[in-house]
């Protein structure tokens, strides 16, 4: 009986540790996509609607803030699209990029952790264009560090929650 009690207590402890594991999945807020034709920071994301969720991490001022030291898997998916019903592209040669950046407040510094994208030729003869970028990686993050997303040509972002999103989840502690 004691073994059973110990076992269930162990399960509970494991479960509560898992539940405390930080994670976040943030989806683009389509009502507040910034303008610009160069690299801009995307600061408006949902954290609590649709597919978006957050636990033991903080979302503030457009940045995802780490609350616990650890090794995290970071990912971002950015979709760009253009349909002729919205008008014409002023230029057919495009650089479509995403940058995942880490900012440290304690030692003021900023580093690009991941970038992805391509130069594209989106011909005016086509009715519809689409391009998707997915980046992901494993990083040591400290409490207080902030993750943010920058993109080129935000006016071409696909505003759907299944198209433009980023997130993180803690995989293990720092030994």
């Amino acid at each position: 009986e004691k073994a059973m009690v110990d076992g269930s207590w162990l399960d509970l402890a494991k479960r509560s540790k898992l539940e405390a594991q930080p994670f976040a999945h943030l989806t683009i807020n389509a009502t507040d996509i910034p303008s610009g034709s160069h690299k801009v920071s995307l600061s408006s994301w949902y954290h609590d609607r649709g597919w978006a969720k957050i636990s033991n991490m903080t979302f503030s001022n457009g940045k995802l803030i780490v609350n616990q030291d650890g090794f995290y898997y970071l990912y971002a998916n950015i979709c760009f699209r253009h349909h002729e019903t919205s008008g014409d592209l002023a230029t057919e040669y495009l650089q479509l990029m995403v940058y995942v950046t880490k900012t440290s407040i304690k030692i003021p510094s900023s580093h690009t952790l991941m970038k992805g994208g391509s130069t594209k030729y989106w011909s005016g003869n086509s009715e519809f264009h689409f391009y998707s970028i997915n980046v992901g990686g494993f990083f040591k993050l400290r409490s207080g560090e902030e993750i943010s997303i920058e993109v080129s040509n935000p006016s071409l972002l696909d505003p759907d929650q299944d198209a433009t999103y980023f997130g993180a989840f803690k995989v293990r502690d720092i030994d």
Epitope: S35, G36, S37, H82, G87, D88, A90, T91
Partner: antibody
Amino acid sequence: QVQLVQSGAEVRKPGASVKVSCKASGYDFSNYAIHWVRQAPGQRLEWMGWINAGNGNTKFSQKFQGRITVTRDTAASTAYMELRSLRSEDTAVYYCARDISNMVRGIIIAYYFDYWGQGTLVTVSS
Amino acid sequence: EIVMTQSPSSLSASVGDRVTITCRASQSISRYLNWYQLKPGKAPRLLIYGASSLQSGVPSRFSGSGSGAEFTLTISSLQPEDIATYYCQHTRAFGQGTKVEIK
């Protein structure tokens, strides 16, 4: 305030060419596209083409492809539309119009014409 | 190629009347629809963009609605200065125009 001032009326014989100018003032010319639209007597408005004043990129209606040239002089904040091989059906009022989209803020030419020139009457007659 | 069709082609109404002009697109164009006012010898004027957004400086008696393929321009209380031809437009395509006159 934003103004587009076009050149005066022109009379041409069939087969000739005409070049209409559109001088912009009151805004940063290079940050916007200029469209050319015409209206023949008793007809609907007809889009002809646009020029991105910043980079000089152009797009034309297939109807005018090969007959139309649109250029710009950024120093003079002026756009030009030349139509060649004129025929009587080209008799119309030709307008320049500014696209509402600021190219600094995005790269979509939206076809919302927020300011127009006063129009230039081109008459093609033998 | 999208085709824009306006109705009616002309109408006559009294000052103070509510006037409605309809524009249909041959396929869905979301809300990418604009309305212009043309008076003889004057530069055309953008009234409504994006189906329902009132252009700066345009009187509030003008309003636009619709999405997909069917749109309307409404003048809530017709004024003498509203005598003009009105055109709907989606990117490169214009409607054939609606001439508004006073009875």
